[in-house]
Interface confidence: medium
Amino acid sequence: FEIALPRESNITVLIKLGTPTLLAKPCYIVISKRHITMLSIKSGERIVFTFSCQSPENHFVIEIQKNIDCMSGPCPFGEVQLQPSTSLLPTLNRTFIWDVKAHKSIGLELQFSIPRLRQIGPGESCPDGVTHSISGRIDATVVRIGTFCSNGTVSRIKMQEGVKMALHLPWFHPRNVSGFSIANRSSIKRLCIIESVFEGEGSATLMSANYPEGFPEDELMTWQFVVPAHLRASVSFLNFNLSNCERKEERVEYYIPGSTTNPEVFKLEDKQPGNMAGNFNLSLQGCDQDAQSPGILRLQFQVLVQHPQNESNKIYVVDLSNERAMSLTIEPRPVKQSRKFVPGCFVCLESRTCSSNLTLTSGSKHKISFLCDDLTRLWMNVEKTISCTDHRYCQRKSYSLQVPSDILHLPVELHDFSWKLLVPKDRLSLVLVPAQKLQQHTHEKPCNTSFSYLVASAIPSQDLYFGSFCPGGSIKQIQVKQNISVTLRTFAPSFQQEASRQGLTVSFIPYFKEEGVFTVTPDTKSKVYLRTPNWDRGLPSLTSVSWNISVPRDQVACLTFFKERSGVVCQTGRAFMIIQEQRTRAEEIFSLDEDVLPKPSFHHHSFWVNISNCSPTSGKQLDLLFSVTLTPRTVDLT
């Protein structure tokens, strides 16, 4: 055999007697006719030797140690080679050792290619005899991270300050690659991080550093579990001991991405969480131990990953193939933070990719399922854009704003369904016609239905909210000048039962200049409350809105304003209101920035109320609330 080690390779090869056996005949290393029982070869040396027996593997072992110094120069990161190549080495049980020294601030990551690693406990051995022993260091103290076999879940181990990796290969094993690479990372600020990846159902047993001896005092160790979100993970502690703490408390912490209650803190004696969907981290935190009687902290635990138990595997089909410019998002509804552990709540696409949020887009059929203990923790928000790019093509076209039945059939509450209605600027306007007349939500007469329509401008620079409208009122139609968003917002689960009451048609109509026109046909004996858009913030500068109020022939309408003055103070221009009788065209004009608002007035015929704003000074906005009440005429004035 010839072993030649390149100069400055920092490799040392040691051939020595292994565990003594009861073999009668001794065996020696033969070098230059000398018989020796130990041979050390250093960098830059070339040695030719042989053995005095036919089966040296029964007598000798070989250790190949490579020292990697990351303190004084650049680190050779990347795939780690077996040097010298196993084909050049005598067929002895061999141990390759890589000793990497680095600064405390440098993180080192061992990345294991498939097959990943499986940790074994004391007294256990690996079926194929290939073992990986990994240790780290805290200052001058060596810390055993663990011993691992092949065919497991451990894919990466991150440490800092240094790492010692020993790969033991039996003499008969054909392996000629290390199976791992080294990468540098930023400081991990803990003893180590072990990543464990599950491709499907399975389990992994893992142990604290130095197990079964004590975990280093006041240290932190983290395990990161990568679990397909359509599966559930449960943690159980197989064996643990607590040390005697002087300060702080020994504990485990769970970090679940997407959870609102991170980190979840548990005592080691607590029942550990189960039925967790998707990825999670588990950390073991030590304490300051009593110097006289420290005791030991140690932990051996199992993670079991399996398909969800006692849960419906129902698949819901969401057919958006005939929709366009639409997206549907299922997401967690906002909740008040609680410190209590909450199992994951996930929505899955094709039962494969699961996450706490899922967005479905138009043009396809989607199959979804849920992994969630309580579906009321989720809600749906949908956005759909209806755009007309050419006025000649869509003038007078109509579009029904209906929530598709596929969406209503999902077991998750619909929160918002928003239609963005876009028209060519200065070419077309929009009219909204409800299936059932609408009531405007006001403090005086709030909506008490399970849903409302929120109507607002969809022009980015324009802050204009027309209001919230629900079925069961007197507003027959709403005309708006340009792009708007109409959002159907639900307020109660009973929306499912009331869904038939929804129904709004939008039509593209010839362009008009007013920001909005409300057509109101009041019902007898009901008081209709109406208010200017952007209530609480004030009608935008130089904006004009109108109400077209119908009065049946046998009725009289009482128009009442709810304050004496408008309160608006104009910086430039004038704010005014015109009340015009539609039959006679007779009109009254009121200067809103000067005059008092009119006293209650009676109208025997249909009339217009038009309000136009000036550019108000800040804080002196234009907000008006008025009501219309019909009563039967006592005298026929026609």
């Epitope: 366009r324 410019a325 043009g363 755009s387 007309c388 790019t389 050419d390 000649r392 093509y393 869509c394 076209k397």
Partner: antibody, heavy 119, light 107 residues
């Protein structure tokens, strides 16, 4: 099933007129717009214009204003393309196609009518 | 007017290969773009609507990408019956224009 059946090939002299028909069946004509597309021999597709089947109002691309007229007879579910003062460069296959949506895609096409203009 | 430029003009492939056809619009047209296939002596056939939406009856090997101004029609594994001319069409605004076409031919 939905079908658009066009009239047969035409051979015309320069200066003459031609009227190509497109009969719709399997759906209600007035529910969808009707578009016309021209394809000269060995060339690509050119959109000529469309007719609003609800109102009968035609719209033409700039290159097809003047000699080209789109019309409709809803009683027989048929759309028409008439070309007057024919020129040699009008020789092409003319297709009618059904338009879907406000910004249309053409989901059904007629088989095409070859109009040849030659002296 | 939206100008659509298709590339390449001709694409020579063998059955089983992947075809990638490009269509570039002179300005952003969102997803207002459709793809058609035309075989000699036949009318065009709608393959993809609104840049990426599939059409019932069209094999799943046809897919499209968008929105914006750069669009792609992909045939994952070309079948013998796919050799034809492919056109993209803008439906953004009048006039509704077509690209000049890409001829997919057998290598």
């Amino acid at each position: 099933q939905v079908q658009l059946v066009q009239s047969g090939s035409e051979l015309k002299k320069p200066g003459a007129s031609v009227k190509v028909s497109c009969k719709a069946s399997g759906y209600t004509l007035t529910d969808f717009s009707m578009h016309w597309v021209r394809q000269a021999p060995g060339q690509g597709l050119e959109w000529m214009g469309w007719i609003n089947t609800e109102t009968g109002a035609p719209t033409y691309a700039d290159d097809f204003k003047g000699r080209f007229v789109l019309s409709l007879d809803t009683s027989v579910s048929t759309a028409y393309l008439q070309i007057s003062s024919l020129k040699a460069e009008d020789t092409a296959v003319y297709y009618c196609s059904r338009g879907r949506d406000y910004d249309p895609h053409f989901d059904y096409w007629g088989q095409g009518t070859l109009v040849t203009v030659s002296s | 007017e939206i100008v659509l430029t298709q590339s390449p003009a001709t694409l020579s492939l063998s059955p089983g290969e992947r075809a990638t056809l490009s269509c570039r619009a002179s300005q952003s047209i969102s997803d207002f773009l459709h793809w058609y296939q035309q075989k000699p002596g036949q009318a065009p056939r709608l393959l993809i609507k609104y840049a990426s939406q599939s059409i019932s009856g069209i094999p799943a090997r046809f897919s499209g990408s968008g929105p914006g101004s750069d669009f792609t029609l992909t045939i994952s594994s070309v079948e013998p019956e796919d050799f034809a001319v492919y056109y993209c069409q803008s439906a953004h605004s009048f006039p509704y224009t077509f690209g000049q076409g890409t001829k997919l031919e057998i290598k």
